[in-house]
């Protein structure tokens, strides 16, 4: 399936969202770090990323939690993470990114 991510709220800085099961959703910031953000940003053509926590403002699905990338992956889909939609989070805990 086509792997898509987007930044909401700005061009290179904002809430991190992923597309799954034909719907956009957010990522919980549990364990969200710069390695995860770098992989996310790499999917958008940037070379590096910085993790933002409690970015907030999201709605709908929280698709990912406990994302754990090494930082070398080309896609979040290749990283260790909970199964899609399996989380213990609320939207106050939405992850963000700043890409460069």
């Amino acid at each position: 399936s086509f792997q898509r991510v987007r930044i909401m709220g700005g061009t290179n800085r904002g809430r991190a969202e992923v597309y799954y099961n034909n719907e956009w959703g957010t990522i919980c910031d549990d364990d969200w770090d710069n390695n995860d953000a770098t992989v996310f940003c790499r999917m958008l053509g940037y070379s590096r990323g910085r993790a933002l926590s409690s970015y907030g403002g999201g709605s709908g699905n929280i698709w990912l939690d406990n994302v754990n990338c090494r930082g070398t992956e080309n896609s979040l889909w290749d990283c260790s993470k909970n199964s899609w939609g399996n989380h213990n989070c609320v939207h106050n805990e939405d992850a963000g990114v700043e890409c460069s």
Partner: antibody, heavy 120, light 107 residues
Framework: EVQLVESGGGLVQPGSSLKLSCVAS????????MNWIRQAPKKGLEWIAL????????YYADSVKGRFTISRDNSKNTLYLEMNSLRSEDTAMYYC?????????????WGQGVMVTVSS | DVQMTQSPSYLAASPGESVSISCKAS??????LAWYQEKPEKTNKLLIY???TLQSGTPSRFSGSGSGTDFTLTIRNLEPEDFAVYYC?????????FGSGTKLEIK
Amino acid sequence: EVQLVESGGGLVQPGSSLKLSCVASKFTFSNYGMNWIRQAPKKGLEWIALIYYNSNNKYYADSVKGRFTISRDNSKNTLYLEMNSLRSEDTAMYYCAKSLTGGSDYFDSWGQGVMVTVSS
Amino acid sequence: DVQMTQSPSYLAASPGESVSISCKASKSIGTFLAWYQEKPEKTNKLLIYSGSTLQSGTPSRFSGSGSGTDFTLTIRNLEPEDFAVYYCQQHDEYPFTFGSGTKLEIK
């Protein structure tokens, strides 16, 4: 407008302890990362500690690691810095600063600072 | 640690002029850089973050540019309230580090 008010500073002897407080108001304290930054007399700014909005992550500069502890009480809108084994080089103005978001981020609001003097 | 080298340390200018302050990082920090303003009896103010994004409330006469290791803060058409001390700060890696500051004085 965001308000951050530090307290707890003073003159202490080397080797002693001190606990700084920073009371926050006019924003939802529990949603934001918080930092301590210091400035020694005639020296530059030095970031020393960060705590995430939920206290799950804490980071320290090497110069204070193992001696200083950052903590927060979201129910009291208060940030703390417990300082042990104080040294003369810890003499500085200590500022608390709010992060733009819930964790590691730029410092978008600062307090006026509180002075800590370590001297015998 | 990432060393931030700011220049000049002192800068004298007149209202209405334009000035630029340089900040160089000892390694590439992408665009993860902020600029702050320090004034007596006031709390420090975030002016610019992410290298070039103006913080809410920052006048448009301020601008930031650069990426990697070289960054610049430019203030155009200086106003009397702009005379202050300016610091750059990297937010790429721990520990977050600041430049030594630039004091902008009235000529």
